[in-house]
């Protein structure tokens, strides 16, 4: 009779997680006599997977009944695959003893699972930023295999560039894990902006993942502040109103000072919303001008989302005659609305971005 | 190690049963056939039956098929032969073998069981 | 049914010298290209032992002076140079089929 030949047909087998995994086997001689074993690896630290003699392998089946007379296909089937069982397995020969002997292997089978990752989770910056300024979003799914893997990062629905993409571990893996991050240019029209991690593996089918974060999250949008006074009333009173416009979160406390004192503090809430997702605000205070002797210096005092405060002065000139009805009292805007929101005095507040 | 370990000797009065056990250890029980052999005194060998464990097919030899009954029990891994009706020429060592190699032969075998049958 | 008759029914061979056993089969035992032929040794008072299997291929831990030959019908078990402790029944056994044995050779020292 010819030499006994171990085979094992196929170089490498790709299962999906969850399935089943077929590693054919089958031997070209019904002599020597002896078992067959299956192993993972090679050498001392070999794995044993399943022994026709004995031993307990509740996930391994052999395909053909083992005591089938002339039997000479060793196929075993493994259920219920994970990442883990990655690896190469060898169909091994032994001779009947005392014990058995090793007598020959296949050349092996290498078994790789195909994993899916794991949905994509966008995280993005621990504190908000303003417009113009960079954040960063990161972006990462775990558990795939094989390695190859891609990875698009989008602001709505147009495609971005300026990112870092990582796949780890370098090294041959049972899964691997994907973590990428994008550098995005904040605008003050990102109220409303998304931005969408996109992940393609093979095991997807051309279905990608998609994790997404709200730039909402990680936007400020700082408020214009404008300071205005109506025409004077007939009771000697003047109405200033203080428009606080497109400022992002609704967080926001006013402050109305008169002559550097605390007049009212107001904290905004339930504002309506403007397209762009940002919020307006106006404050109103009535000073009676004739309780004033000297020019009454008004100021609106803005702490949005925790900043430091934003100022905007005005003064109301008392006239000479200032009870007489109708008399020409002035008002004078001598605040700046500039975005930086300097305050008149600009040596108590600055504004930082 | 495979150890195949019979039950002790039997006495039976003609027309009796008898029921002799064979314990396996040192392999996968349900994946090699136990066979069944006699030999009387001073006589050759004579095949029984055979059974597979994992399923209970069996295979009889006509001589038997109608007295002998085989069956296992895989929780305890053993292997049992029944014999009805026994008559004197029933008189015999009963042996139980494993075929390691599906083979159908005799690869390990116990130390036997003696079954006399006289009134 | 196979019957399988072995010649002679005993032998006596002096120590040293070859012992021949025949076994022949009512009809060919040869399929899927084996000849499914083994031999047995039993020595007394205990079980037999696997000596042979698929006509010529010697079982695990059998000294090497046993060896088995033949095709078809007609099969040879041949001890190369008899010791003392080869003194035994041997028997012949077919598995074409449902199983037989022979009906054993007993061999002897001279």
């Known amino acids: 009779e010819e030499e006994l030949q171990v085979i094992q047909p196929e170089k490498s087998v790709s299962v999906a997680a969850g399935e089943s995994a077929t590693l054919n086997c089958t031997a070209t001689s019904l002599i020597p006599v002896g078992p067959i074993q299956w192993f993972r690896g090679v050498g001392p630290g070999r794995e044993l997977i399943y022994s026709q003699k004995e031993g307990h392998f509740p996930r391994v089946t052999p395909v053909s009944d083992p005591t089938k007379r002339n039997n000479m296909d060793f196929s075993i089937r493994i259920s219920n695959i994970t990442p883990a069982d990655a690896g190469t397995y060898y169909c091994v020969k032994f001779r009947k003893g005392s014990p058995d002997v090793e007598l020959k292997s296949g050349a092996g089978t290498e078994l790789s699972v195909r994993a899916k990752p794991s949905a994509p989770v966008v995280s993005g910056p621990a504190v908000r930023a303003t417009a113009e300024h960079t954040v960063s979003f990161t972006c990462e799914s775990h558990g795939f295999s094989p390695r190859d893997i891609t990875l698009k990062w989008f602001k709505n629905g147009n495609e971005l560039s300026d990112f870092q993409t990582n796949v780890d571990p370098a090294g041959k893996s049972v899964s691997y894990s994907i973590r990428s991050t994008a550098r995005v240019v904040l605008t003050r029209r990102d109220v409303h902006s998304q931005v969408i991690c996109e992940v393609a593996h093979v095991t997807l089918q051309g279905d990608p993942l998609r994790g997404t974060a709200n730039l909402s999250e990680a936007i400020r949008v700082p408020p214009f502040l404008e300071v205005t006074q109506q025409s004077m009333r007939a009771d000697n009173q003047v109405n200033v109103t203080c428009q606080v416009t497109k400022f992002y979160p609704q967080r926001l406390q006013l402050t109305w000072l008169e002559n550097g004192n605390v007049s009212r503090t107001e904290m905004a809430s339930a504002l309506p919303e403007n397209k762009d997702g940002t919020y307006n605000w106006t404050s109103w205070l009535l000073v009676n001008v004739s309780a004033h002797r000297d020019d009454v210096k008004l100021t609106c005092q803005v702490e949005h989302d925790g900043q430091p405060a934003v100022n905007k002065s005005f003064s109301v000139k008392v006239s000479a005659h200032p009870k007489e009805q109708g008399s020409n009292t002035a008002a004078e805007n001598t605040g700046t609305n500039e975005r930086d929101y300097k305050d008149d005095d600009d040596k108590h507040h600055h504004h930082h971005h | 190690q495979v150890q195949l370990v019979q039950s002790g000797a039997e006495v039976k009065k003609p027309g009796a049963s008898v029921k002799v056990s064979c314990k396996a250890s040192g392999y996968t029980f349900t994946n090699y056939w136990i066979n069944w052999v006699r030999q009387a005194p001073g006589q050759g060998l004579e095949w029984i039956a055979m059974i597979d464990p994992s399923d209970s097919e069996t295979h009889y030899n006509q001589i038997f098929k109608d007295r002998a009954t085989l069956t296992t029990d895989t929780s305890t891994s053993t292997a049992y032969m029944e014999l009805r009706s026994l008559r004197s020429d029933d008189t015999a060592v009963y042996y139980c073998a494993m075929d390691y190699g599906s083979l159908y032969a005799m690869d390990y075998w116990g130390r036997g069981t003696l079954v006399t049958v006289s009134s | 049914d196979i019957v399988l008759t072995q010649s002679p029914d005993s032998l006596a061979v002096s120590l040293g010298e070859r012992a021949t056993i025949n076994c022949r089969a009512s009809?060919?035992?040869?399929?899927?290209?084996?000849?499914?032929i083994f031999w047995y040794q039993q020595k007394p008072g205990q079980p037999p032992k696997l000596l042979i299997y698929?006509?010529?291929n010697r079982d695990s831990g059998v000294p090497d002076r046993f060896s088995g030959s033949g095709s078809g019908t007609d099969f040879t078990l041949t001890i190369s140079s008899l010791q003392a402790e080869d003194v035994a029944v041997y028997y012949c056994q077919h598995s074409r089929e449902l199983p037989t044995f022979g009906q054993g050779t007993k061999l002897e020292i001279k």
């Open positions: 698929l006509a010529s």
């Open positions: 009809q060919s035992v040869r399929s899927s290209g084996y000849n499914w």
